[in-house]
């Protein structure tokens, strides 16, 4: 940091800088294609790099597709390197889902394949893990291509829009279970293709208007099968097909694997699919009441042509204090022989650690322990398991890469902790195919740094991107600083972060904006470097932007995370208010100018806080908030709240609404914002807040964004919302 004794003449980070992305963080997005090579796009050429030596050659020149006539959205190389799949005509659907057109380029013949093309409006395509088979989903049915230039084999015939989904997820499975559109899983050698089939026949539809172009006289109505809390859920079936025995004159034979008996007794979800070996697959199933899950391990039986899941190999995972997993049960990482696996589960103390399972034994052995958590298992070799955790220096908001020796669990090495401890405290990793090399991606607290390493001796090979150009540019900008610390409430540490204005002076009084999310297993206090709206508010407007991880937040054990079980809208809301009270006691906060804002769950918490009548907050902004949990989707809501029935938790569903707090909004200034085409948190939620406020005579401000979804991310809407919110905050804080 520059320490200027005289007035700092450098420019600040402005709202325009944020909206126009003036200062861009450089990424280094590589794609591993083997254990020692990766692809990287440079000036639109695709280069192939040797990891050991760093030398590169042109894999595909940018001129290759000059005559293609379409703007290529993405590409994917077949595992054998013979073909490249080109994606164009991209049309977004929901968070992950989209349709697109595809063409296949033959890298040997150096020409596009023109016969037997994949149809337009394809919903998902994926190469087999080896070779060049393709599986794709079109019109909710699955097709397989054995050769890119030959006709496809149709695998399913039951697909029906909004009713039966083969190989792709419906809305709720996409958003809340798999975080993906794909519901297809190739076996490691590409012989078998496993897939889920979802049936939404009885799932109620959410309907909303889509206004589209001004010339459209009557708005379109969008209808989406969307199960709200307590409503009829989709049902699921699971199948495996052998793609080595497909024929053009017979229908493909899909063998069903049914859910365990303990699941079939009631509503349930398929929540994880992991291939263990070429002929062994593990499935995890979860009850609708998400405190009980079962893993089945199923083997292919050649003599019968069936998949057998032995009851003796079932592994039950349950929670007595909340729900299973952070958001769902974690995935298993199998050893090469498929006879054992490693999995992140909650230990006796409620911290998430790695446990070693043998498939035929019920109990597992924890290989990590401590008052910290394993975030993810990143790679497994014959000798080591690599994982990311937040153990280092007891900072839940940090992330580092570790390796543990499988022959001696006491031998643990942190591979990233000491590489660049000031600059880098938050790492993610990308391993080569067999984990011989890895890319470390440091995302803070300093500028992002990308480096390449060898697993043989864990030595750093080279810097891939250090953002030095951005660093040089930011030297000329008065940038905020970031403080990460904790407060102690009831003998428990709770972490917060503050984005502090340039030349922060603790003897001065600053307005404070509390930036909140506070959903279950969330984390807003971390060591990540960001250039965002908060950067502008702190740099240009001299506002402190703070975030606090209270009860319900993640990565600090289940005591904290499960505190809000069955009680959304209580402790996590109260803790944000308490945090603001604590901040206002710090001496540098103007307690007459404290605001709060949040999006989605953060919008809900913001609204609940503002409706609490605490007197702590002058104003606040809720973007796309939940307002009543019966309006939100079943999978997410019921995980934490159970069912909205008198026998279960209806009372708390009813007393955790924003609308019931309407009267208290008379004491605050409130800005309510929502996109009219929000498929996730429906416009209905804000419409009901608005109605309740109007009914009790509360004056408030509101903005809708026509045809915008939950992200309000179109270029014009994004700029408008942040400009609008900036005006509101400045007015609230009496800033010029």
């Amino acid at each position: 940091h520059h320490h200027h004794h005289h007035a700092d003449s450098r420019k600040t980070y402005t709202l325009t800088d944020y909206l126009k992305n003036t200062y861009r963080l450089k990424l280094y997005s590589l794609r591993w294609i083997s254990d020692h090579e990766y692809l990287y796009k440079q000036e639109n050429n695709i280069l192939v790099f040797n990891a050991e030596y760093g030398n590169s050659s042109v894999f595909l020149e940018n001129s290759t597709f000059d005559e293609f006539g379409h703007s290529i959205n993405d590409y994917s190389i077949s595992p054998d390197g013979q073909f490249i799949l080109l994606e164009y005509n991209y049309v977004k659907q929901w968070r992950h889902s989209y349709t697109a057109s595809y063409d296949i380029y033959d890298l040997n013949k150096r020409q596009l394949i023109t016969e037997e093309r994949i149809p337009n409006n394809t919903q998902w395509v994926t190469w087999s893990p080896v070779g060049h088979k393709l599986a794709y989903v079109w019109n909710n049915d699955i097709y397989v291509k054995i050769e890119p230039n030959l006709p496809s084999y149709r695998i399913t015939w039951t697909g029906k829009e909004d009713i039966i989904y083969n190989g792709i997820t419906d809305w709720v499975y996409e958003e809340e279970v798999f975080s993906a559109y794909s519901a297809l899983w190739w076996s490691p050698n590409g012989t078998f293709l496993a897939y889920a089939q979802f049936n939404d026949t009885e799932v109620p539809l959410i309907e909303y208007s889509f206004y589209s172009d001004e010339s459209l006289q009557y708005p379109k109505t969008v209808r989406v099968p969307y199960p709200k809390a307590g409503a009829v859920n989709p049902t699921v079936k699971f199948f495996v097909v052998n793609t080595d025995s497909l024929s053009s004159v017979t229908n493909a034979t899909s063998i069903q694997i049914t859910a365990p008996a303990s699941m079939l007794i009631g509503d349930h979800y398929l929540c994880d699919v992991t291939w263990a070996t070429q002929e062994r697959i593990s499935l995890q199933w979860l009850r609708r009441i998400q405190n009980y899950s079962v893993m089945d391990i199923c083997d292919y039986d050649e003599s019968s042509g069936r998949w057998n899941c032995l009851v003796a190999r079932q592994h039950i995972e349950m929670s007595t204090t909340g729900w299973v997993g952070r958001f769902r049960p974690s995935e298993p990482h199998f050893t090469l022989d498929g006879n054992s696996f490693y999995k992140i589960i909650s230990n006796e103390e409620g911290y998430r650690h790695i446990c070693y399972f043998q498939i035929d034994k019920k109990d597992c052995t924890f290989i990590t322990k401590g008052t910290w958590e394993v975030i993810g298992i990143e790679a497994l070799t014959s000798d080591y398991l690599y994982y990311i955790s937040n153990e280092y220096k007891g900072m839940p908001g940090g992330r580092n890469l570790y390796k543990i020796q499988l022959s001696d669990y006491t031998k643990v090495t942190c591979l990233s902790c000491e590489l660049n401890p000031e600059r880098c405290q938050y790492y993610s990793v990308s391993f080569s195919k067999e984990a011989k090399y890895y890319q470390l991606r440091c995302s803070g607290p300093g500028l992002p740094l990308y480096t390449l390493h060898s697993s043989v001796n864990d030595k750093g090979l080279r810097v891939l991107e250090d953002n030095s150009a951005l660093d040089k540019m930011l030297q000329n900008v008065q940038m905020p600083s970031k403080k990460l610390d904790f407060i102690i409430l009831n003998e428990t540490k709770f972490w917060y972060q503050m984005i502090l204005p340039p030349h922060f002076d603790k003897s001065k009084k600053y307005p404070l904006l509390l930036d909140v999310y506070a959903g279950p297993c969330s984390q807003k206090a971390d060591t990540v470097f960001r250039l965002n709206w908060a950067t502008y508010l702190a740099s240009t407007e001299n506002i402190i932007v703070a975030s606090f991880d209270g009860r319900g937040s993640g990565y600090q054990g289940d005591k904290i995370m499960h505190a809000i079980n069955r009680r959304l809208g209580t402790f996590e809301v109260e803790d944000q208010i308490e945090a603001a009270r604590q901040f206002s006691k710090m001496g540098f906060v103007d307690n007459k100018r404290i605001a709060i804002w949040g999006w989605s769950y953060g919008g809900y918490v913001t609204s609940m806080v503002l409706g609490s009548g605490s007197g702590v907050f002058k104003c606040g902004i809720a973007v796309a908030p939940v307002s009543r949990w019966e309006y939100y989707d079943s999978v997410y809501t019921e995980r934490y709240m159970g069912l909205p029935t008198p026998e279960d938790n209806l009372d708390h569903y009813r007393n955790s609404t924003v609308m019931s707090r309407a009267e208290n909004f008379k004491q605050v200034e409130y800005l309510l914002i929502h996109g009219t085409a929000d498929d996730n948190v429906h416009f209905q939620q804000s419409a009901q807040i608005s109605k309740a406020l109007v009914d009790v005579g509360v004056d408030f401000q509101a903005m809708w964004y026509t045809d915008e979804d939950h992200g309000i991310a179109s270029s014009t809407a994004h700029q408008h919302i942040y400009t609008h919110m900036s005006h509101f905050i400045k007015q609230c804080f009496s800033l010029p």
Partner: antibody, heavy 117, light 107 residues
Framework: EVQLQQSGAELTKPGSSVKISCKAS????????IGWLKQRPGQALEWIGY????????GYNEKFKGKATLTVDKSSSTAFMQLSSLTPEDTAVYYC??????????WGQGVMVTVSS | DIVMTQSPSSLPASLGERVTISCRAS??????LNWYQQKPDGTIKPLIY???RLQSGVPSRFSGSGSGTDYSLTISSLEPEDFAMYYC?????????FGAGTKVELK
């Protein structure tokens, strides 16, 4: 080596039934479909239908529904086709074949079924 | 069902001769056309799939071509073992259907 070994020739009377077999070897029987075809002298081969030994799934050509019944015995890796209510029109050579990819890649040697009073 | 019409039904030819067999479909079959050989002893094997792709192990003197409804099989230079029946078959729609066959015989 992949082989489909069919049973011997049949001479039978109108109205009766006949069951012919096709024993598979050299590949995993439960993995692949088994198809059946009819060939009358001087006429085109006709597709009767197929069975998947693993799932028991069957697909018939509409024309042969009620005429042909396909079954398998997994323990002996054998597929069977029963032809019922036989008429002289059913006199033909019947083949079993393994459909794979775009073709019928392996064929049995054929069974001559003669229906005569 | 799609009707496959083969011509000629009989094709007398000499060793070393180039012969072509035709096959017409009653509707477009988008290249989904295969050829089979049936030897005098009744054994049947595939020769060509998807109009022009050679089945593994089939000599390169066999070739196929065509599009839409019209397809052909060519043997560039007849060998003694090539005297046999040849059938075309479509797999564009169910049920798969065959032509009545062409007998290539020694002139």
């Amino acid at each position: 080596e992949v082989q489909l070994q069919q049973s011997g020739a049949e001479l039978t009377k109108p109205g009766s039934s006949v069951k012919i077999s096709c024993k598979a070897s050299g590949f995993t029987f439960t993995t692949y479909d088994i198809g059946w075809l009819k060939q009358r002298p001087g006429q085109a081969l006709e597709w009767i239908g197929y069975i998947n030994p693993g799932s028991g799934g069957i697909g018939y050509n509409e024309k042969f529904k009620g005429k042909a019944t396909l079954t398998v015995d997994k323990s002996s890796s054998t597929a069977f086709m029963q032809l019922s209510s036989l008429t002289p029109e059913d006199t033909a050579v019947y083949y079993c074949a393994r459909p794979l990819r775009r073709v019928l890649d392996y064929w049995g040697q054929g069974v001559m079924v003669t229906v005569s009073s | 069902d799609i009707v496959m019409t083969q011509s000629p039904s009989s094709l007398p030819a000499s060793l070393g001769e180039r012969v072509t067999i035709s096959c017409r479909a009653s509707q477009g079959i988008s290249n989904k056309l295969n050829w089979y050989q049936q030897k005098p002893d009744g054994t049947i094997k595939p020769l060509i799939y998807y109009t022009s792709r050679l089945q593994s192990g089939v000599p390169s003197r066999f070739s196929g071509s065509g599009s839409g409804t019209d397809y052909s099989l060519t043997i560039s230079s007849l060998e003694p073992e090539d005297f046999a029946m040849y059938y075309c078959q479509q797999d564009a729609s169910f049920p798969p259907t065959f032509g009545a066959g062409t007998k290539v015989e020694l002139k």
